[in-house]
């Protein structure tokens, strides 16, 4: 499967949509900044094989999809942009799932990188907890939007893994 190119294109489209979703000026939200601790050190220090990269990226996109599919999210963002963004994420998930089947030959993601997947889940738990603590305020969502954009950009090591042959 030609994942690097399709993923890169969809990823760019998702980031553009996410950038357009802002409703308030980020300048007014500086005091709401928060340390979510994206596990970039763990990712940077690891050379991902293709199947590993696919499964971790899948988890990141799935968690992002879940986060932006909540009722609170629907209230926070402009509906048509949110729908386009969710559709883009859903397509990425489909692409990754199709690729896993092709790469591994089974409909199961290998369990070799549970630690990385757990790190991603904990990261999104911290984001969800922050939103709850901030009562899903517009600024809290703005901070989360910026954080998701950053984490999407940070996953370069994972994207390098997509180009590798297992």
């Amino acid at each position: 499967c030609d994942l690097p190119q399709t993923h890169s294109l969809r990823n760019r489209r998702a980031l553009i949509l996410l950038a357009q979703m802002g409703r308030i000026s980020p300048f007014s939200c500086l005091k709401d900044r928060h340390e979510f601790r994206f596990p970039e050190e763990e990712f940077d220090g690891h050379q991902f094989q293709k199947t590993q990269a696919i499964s971790v990226l899948h988890e990141m996109i799935q968690q992002t999809f879940n986060l932006f599919s909540t009722e609170d999210s629907s209230a926070a963002w402009e509906q048509s942009l949110l729908e386009k963004f969710s559709t883009e994420l859903y397509q990425q998930l489909n692409d990754l799932e199709a690729c896993v089947i092709q790469e591994v030959g089974v409909e199961e993601t290998p369990l070799m990188n549970e630690d990385f997947i757990l790190a991603v889940r904990k990261y999104f738990q911290r984001i969800t907890l922050y939103l709850m603590e901030k009562k899903y305020s517009p600024c809290a969502w703005e901070v989360v939007r910026a954080e998701i954009m950053r984490s999407f950009s940070f996953s370069t090591n994972l994207k390098k893994g997509l180009r590798r042959k297992d």
């Epitope: 802002g22 000026s25 980020p26 500086l30 900044r33 703005e142 954080e147 950009s153």
Partner: antibody, heavy 121, light 107 residues
Framework: EVQLVQSGAEVKKPGESLKISCKGS????????IGWVRQMPGKGLEWMGI????????RYSPSFQGQVTISADKSISTAYLQWSSLKASDTAMYYC??????????????WGQGTLVTVSS | DIQMTQSPSSLSASVGDRVTITCRAS??????LNWYQQKPGKAPKLLIY???SLQSGVPSRFSGSGSGTDFTLTISSLQPEDFATYYC?????????FGQGTKVEIK
């Protein structure tokens, strides 16, 4: 390598206009805000304003509001600071620096080398 | 605007001395405080961000502490290259503001 490269020193007369630049490279220009800081001869640092190059949203310090204009051209990864009518009191070193916006990352971690503006008749 | 007040405005110290500079904000800024070092003719250099995080590449003799309104920059053992002017800056709300600076001179 992250770099902010500013335009060269300028010598101007009072009443003239001026636009100085700050070109970012080695990072995603639209992922960081660009701030401008003034330092008058022998004095401390004064924060002037900031721009988000992704949408050109701008904020100024009250002391500089209406005195200068901050802009950006994301297609060439460049931020600008401009004056429509310079005064002798605008004589200073001007620095640009990048800011991570709402992300939890170091504030103003990279600075331009500075542009010295001299206004004299 | 939030006012930032640094003290002292200047100090004389010797190599090996422990140096402490304080910065006070006119209202709470949580931990959104940065410290910069500036040498003559050079651009400022970030030393500490978010009150206590050491910027990459900065020697561990520099440390920052505090939250709310009172902050401290400490140089545990002053080195010859540390003679410079130090500024604090709040990034809690716009407009960002700097302290007036503290000049560290050789005794």
């Amino acid at each position: 390598e992250v770099q902010l490269v500013q335009s060269g020193a300028e010598v101007k007369k009072p009443g003239e206009s001026l636009k100085i630049s700050c070109k970012g490279s080695g990072y995603s220009f639209t992922s960081y805000w660009i701030g401008w800081v003034r330092q008058m001869p022998g004095k401390g640092l004064e924060w002037m304003g900031i721009i988000d190059p992704s949408d050109s949203d701008t904020r100024y310090s009250p002391s500089f509001q209406g005195q200068v204009t901050i802009s950006a051209d994301k297609s060439i990864s460049t931020a600008y600071l401009q004056w429509s009518s310079l005064k002798a009191s605008d004589t200073a070193m001007y620095y640009c620096a990048r800011h991570p916006g709402l992300n939890w990352a170091p504030d103003f971690d990279y600075w331009g080398q500075g542009t010295l503006v001299t206004v004299s008749s | 605007d939030i006012q930032m007040t640094q003290s002292p405005s200047s100090l004389s110290a010797s190599v090996g001395d422990r140096v402490t500079i304080t910065c006070r904000a006119s209202q709470s800024i949580s931990k959104f405080l940065n410290w910069y070092q500036q040498k003559p003719g050079k651009a400022p250099k970030l030393l500490i961000y978010f009150a206590s995080s050491l910027q990459s590449g900065v020697p561990s003799r520099f440390s920052g502490s505090g939250s709310g309104t009172d902050f401290t920059l400490t140089i545990s053992s002053l080195q010859p290259e540390d003679f410079a002017t130090y500024y604090c800056q709040q990034s809690n709300t716009l407009p960002f503001t700097f302290g007036q600076g503290t000049k560290v001179e050789i005794k």
